[in-house]
Interface confidence: low
């Protein structure tokens, strides 16, 4: 049914879906704090621009009786139930923030006539790619795939002189929401990653992974997995690893590698960690102080969603344009706005661009060091450490196929 939007006459409302099922197990109170912090910033920016308007958020909670698993598995209907609740209350804002689960976002996008923008902190899966009124503020699986293909093909760096075309992917089904969809994208037979690789096998059992580490007949030296160092240790322990094995550990939303006092454990020496470039130090200042590094990124995405709305609202109001139009709904893409910890760039499809960082463990210092960075906006790799102190022979990454290149 047609729901009137509280989005005119100097009063602009944001509908925030507070779903029990979420991409990260973050207390809803922390997300409220993030939204409120964002509102404060937006109000100040609008006031600085001489726009005397009111911006508020309405938090829409699900009843929690039916959808109470807490993770994303039962989220498909929760988003639709919340939309029904909004519809019944005739209370829709100018923009919808949430949901974060791929299942619920996909279903909501499918089942509603979206004439308003939807901003998500999550929705990592490929099924949420290329949605005209959906904006995603945490790196989606497509961005990871493009990095991996770019890195696999790279062969002109002092520390990587071979193109790779093979990989194992470890995926045991217990992953967090972000990892689940990242690995799902790598597993998919029709994905860009699968299309570009000559060989790819998914390892689903711990034993399969453990056996590959020393298997002389392995088809690839490269294993991709997703999670933190503790997750890797639980799986790998102190087992011996063939010297030409390279483990790519995808751990995007974890700032801990950059903390001054962090020492890399010994089991990380064969590992390249893919993470995101850490933000501005002001992130330690306010709403995020008591959040874990991962949860900080999640709450930050909510906050940045508010700032994005404020950015677009300011532009449209300054141009005297109507907010409740398809033009507004489709405008949340191909732009850069001032986020909480610096500029945030959205690509042509409304997905956040970022700087991914590939780290290695220095055998000299036992510290994580930046090997290279990758700009998702231009799909380009920038080497940082031209003479890395690798564990691998000749301080070069081995070939991906056993028996060729430095062993």
């Amino acid at each position: 049914s047609q729901v009137s939007q509280n989005c005119h006459n100097g009063s602009y409302e944001i509908s925030v879906l507070m779903m029990g099922n979420s991409a990260f197990a973050e207390p809803l109170k922390n997300l409220e704090d993030a939204v409120n912090e964002g509102l404060e910033i937006v109000r100040g920016r609008l006031q600085n621009a001489g726009l005397n308007v009111t911006v508020n958020a309405t938090f829409m909670y699900s009843d929690g009786l039916i959808h109470n698993s807490g993770d994303c598995r039962s989220s498909t209907c929760e988003g639709l139930d919340l939309l029904r609740k909004i519809s019944n209350a005739q209370r829709m804002g100018c923009v919808l923030i949430g949901p974060s689960c791929t299942y619920s976002t996909f279903q909501m996008y499918l089942d509603t006539e979206l004439s308003y923008p939807m901003i998500s902190a999550g929705s990592f899966g490929l099924s949420c790619d290329y949605k005209e009124t959906l904006t995603r503020l945490m790196s989606p699986a497509r961005k990871l795939m493009y990095f991996l293909v770019n890195f696999w093909k790279t062969n002109d760096l002092p520390f990587k002189t071979y193109s790779w075309s093979t990989s194992y992917v470890y995926k045991n089904g217990t992953e967090t929401e972000d990892c689940f969809w990242y690995l799902n994208a790598l597993e998919a037979s029709v994905s860009y990653f699968s299309h570009e690789l000559g060989f790819k096998v998914v390892l689903r059992q711990d034993k399969e992974f453990q056996d590959i580490l020393m298997d002389h007949n392995r088809k690839s030296n490269v294993i991709i997995m997703c999670g933190g160092p503790e997750f890797l240790y639980k799986l790998k322990g102190d087992r011996a690893v063939a010297e030409d094995i390279v483990i790519i550990l995808v751990d995007l939303f974890n700032d801990q590698y950059f903390e001054d006092n962090v020492t890399a454990p010994d089991y990380m020496k064969n590992v390249l960690v893919l993470t995101l470039s850490p933000g501005n130090s002001l992130l330690n200042s306010s709403f995020s102080r008591n959040l874990s590094p991962t949860k900080r990124d999640f709450a930050l995405a909510y906050l940045n969603g508010i700032l994005l709305f404020g950015h677009m609202l300011k532009i449209f109001l300054e141009n005297g344009e109507n907010i409740t139009t398809p033009k507004f709904a489709h405008a949340f893409r191909n732009l850069t706005f001032e986020g909480y910890d610096g500029p945030v760039t959205l690509d042509d499809w409304g997905d956040v661009d970022s700087t991914m960082v590939l780290l290695y463990t220095s055998v000299d210092t036992k510290k994580y060091k930046v090997l290279l960075t990758y700009d998702t906006h231009v799909n380009k790799t920038y080497p940082v450490d031209m003479s890395p102190t690798f564990t691998w022979k000749n301080s070069k990454l081995p070939n991906d196929i056993t028996g060729r290149g430095p062993q």
């Epitope: 404060e40 100040g44 920016r45 501005n280 130090s281 002001l282 330690n284 001032e338 610096g342």
Partner: antibody
Framework: QVQLVESGGGVVQPGRSLRLSCAVS????????VHWVRQAPGKGLEWLGV???????DYNAAFISRLTISKDNSKSTVYLQMNSLRAEDTAVYYC?????????????WGQGTLVTVSS | DIQMTQSPSSLSASVGDRVTITCRAS??????LNWYQQKPGKTFKLLVY???RLQSGVPSRFSGSGSGTDYTFTISSLQPEDIATYFC?????????FGQGTKVEIK
Amino acid sequence: QVQLVESGGGVVQPGRSLRLSCAVSGFTFSNYGVHWVRQAPGKGLEWLGVIWSGGRKDYNAAFISRLTISKDNSKSTVYLQMNSLRAEDTAVYYCARHGTYPYWYFALWGQGTLVTVSS
Amino acid sequence: DIQMTQSPSSLSASVGDRVTITCRASQDISNYLNWYQQKPGKTFKLLVYYTSRLQSGVPSRFSGSGSGTDYTFTISSLQPEDIATYFCQQGKTLPFSFGQGTKVEIK
């Protein structure tokens, strides 16, 4: 007009506490964070802490054990409570409204209230 | 914590002179540098924020520049009403910190 007015200053004995008030008018109190800054005689400025619009607080680590900032939205007033005062806490205490992110400036200051710690 | 070093601590100049004050941060503050004026017996007034942005209503003779750790505040033509102490402040990270101040007098 837009203003912040501090009160509660005066002479306090060492070891005692003080509670200063900052009454805000002329703007929507609940939309802004309010900072406390002090200026000791002949010395520089020290940032003490802030209470954000949603009620969250950040303190200068040097004062965190004896400083409490609070507010009453209904009275549009922010409070600074400081315990275990010593002579070096003698200063003019200012409240200030914070500016718009990302610039983090003090957009507007009160006139200050003098606190003298002396026996 | 970030330390701010401001110089000179005082200066004396004639009306019409160009006056320059510098502020150095102990680490890169990414242009999050603000300047305030405190006239004798009065409170503080924001003049310049984010290195070079002039606060509304502030005369154009005041300006700021700089990057990284080094910043400059300039009064292009000193006026009698500019007698005051000027402070820099970093807004890069908490706790916010200030320079020690520069007292400007007329010769």
